[in-house]
């Protein structure tokens, strides 16, 4: 496959990446109310998010909650928050550098310098991906760890929510497609040493005989 | 041996606030969730409220909701309860208690509160 | 919430004699997840804080006199007391340990 096509394709599932990590940290679904038992006959499922807490009756209506008070949220979700919208923000920061770095683009000149920009939005996108990994996974071993747990109450339990899914597809996606950013910008190089151009010594002048030394040829 | 030992109880005006301490010993206390039990004069018990582990989730009977908080210092091995806009009704003997699995397993001697003008 | 209905409210007994409490909740306590029912008891002498006798509704804690038997399931539940003895006079609460609010019965009270 050409750099161009990875390039293109390394950019498309970040973009769907970015937009499932959008979408991850705006719906209240990161938790849900566990149903254990039989006997415990409820009206209404409970949603916890990021940002809003929402209430679903059997009826099908549902009323949401924003919360009020940032000192009030658990540590999970307080850092779920920072780390999440870093990493949505980060994502934005990496589509222009990919952009800029991207051969159908003329931001930057053609050449190494182009390739180590491209390079850069593909591990941005990496760490992107890892830096949402960390909020989702630490809020999902929360969950599962409490559902466990016999000494919490048994409506105090939950399990994982819809928005932790899409989150880790959101992430694999980023992170994916953040390999083939880094794949493009290396093919498109030809040489793995993206670090600093290759210098080379300016030709001496010609020998007697009018030759140049061979040596100086590459 | 496990001993709780509960202080700071007294007698106080509707409206006003007490902090209750309960001093915990004899067990690893950062591995239980905490608990504190109230018994009004010769009446029966009513929970009040939980703590987890660490301090991070507490859960409250709808009596005290918003106007108790149940809080922890695992390094001092603490459990407390800040108690505001106390009322007559709130007068008891307030039992810490070890929670595990739900249930209470040991008790503090318990403190007498007492809410009057 | 889960009431919790105890009965009787006071009962006269002699040492000896078995002596059975009973307890009924307004919802089952049975867990079909984990296979449980989630109901202890405990005893309070005068003057004293109470004292945990059984757990998850048959399970004494250690410590405990095996006279002291807990039975039941579902919504109905009993303290049977083997052989009464002069230090069992106290009042005994059933209690739910199954979800919050933990709710207490109103208890029953053994008196000579």
């Known amino acids: 496959m050409g750099s161009a096509a990875l390039e293109i394709l390394g950019l498309v599932l970040c973009l769907v990446g970015w937009g499932g990590l959008i979408l991850a940290c705006g719906l209240p679904m990161w938790q849900v109310t566990a149903f254990l038992d039989h006997n415990i006959v409820t009206a209404q499922t409970t949603w916890k998010g990021l940002w809003m807490s929402c209430v679903v009756q059997s009826t099908g209506h549902m009323q949401c909650k924003v919360y009020d008070s940032v000192l009030a949220l658990s540590t999970e979700v307080q850092a779920a928050r920072a780390l999440t919208v870093s990493a949505v923000l980060l994502a934005f920061v990496a589509l222009f550098v990919t952009l800029a770095g991207a051969q159908c683009t003329t931001c930057v000149a053609p050449g190494p310098a182009k390739a180590r920009v491209a390079l850069t939005g593909g591990v941005l996108y990496l760490f992107c991906g890892l830096l949402a990994l960390v909020p989702l996974c630490w809020f999902a071993n929360i969950v599962v760890r409490e559902f466990y747990d016999p000494s919490v109450p048994v409506s105090q339990k939950y399990e994982l929510g819809a928005a932790l899914y899409i989150g880790w597809a959101a992430t694999a996606l980023l992170m994916v497609g953040g390999c083939l950013l880094c794949c493009g910008a290396w093919v498109c190089t030809g040489r793995p040493d993206l670090s600093f151009p290759v210098k080379y010594s300016a030709p001496r002048r010609p020998t007697a005989t009018g030759d140049y030394d061979k040596k100086n040829y590459v | 041996e496990v001993q709780l030992v509960e202080s700071g109880g007294g007698l106080v005006q509707p409206g006003r606030s007490l902090k209750l301490s309960c001093a915990a010993s004899g067990f690893t206390f950062s591995d239980y969730f905490m608990a504190w039990v109230r018994q009004a004069p010769k009446k029966g018990l009513e929970w009040v409220a939980s703590i987890n582990y660490e301090g991070s989730r507490t859960y409250y009977g709808d009596s005290v909701k918003d106007r108790f908080t149940i809080s922890r210092d695992n390094t001092k091995t603490t459990l407390y309860l800040q108690m505001t806009s106390l009322r007559s009704e709130d007068t008891a003997t307030y039992y810490c208690?070890?929670?595990?699995?739900?249930?209470?397993?040991?008790w503090g001697q318990g403190v007498m509160v007492t809410v009057s003008s | 919430d889960i009431v919790m209905t105890q009965s009787p409210s006071s009962l006269a007994v002699s040492a000896g004699e078995t002596v059975t409490i009973n307890c009924k909740s307004s919802r089952s306590l049975f867990s079909s997840g984990y296979q449980e029912n989630y109901l202890a008891w405990y005893q309070q002498k005068p003057g004293q804080s109470p004292k945990m006798l059984i757990y998850?509704?048959?399970t004494r804690e250690s410590g405990v006199p095996d006279r002291f038997i807990g039975s039941g399931s579902g919504t109905d539940f009993t303290l049977t007391i083997n052989t009464l003895q002069a230090e069992d006079l106290a009042i005994y609460y059933c209690?739910?340990?199954?979800?919050?609010?933990?709710?207490f019965g109103a208890g029953t009270k053994l008196e000579l």
């Open positions: 209690q739910q340990h199954y979800d919050i609010p933990y709710t």
């Open positions: 208690a070890r929670h595990p699995r739900r249930y209470f397993d040991f």
């Open positions: 998850l509704a048959s």
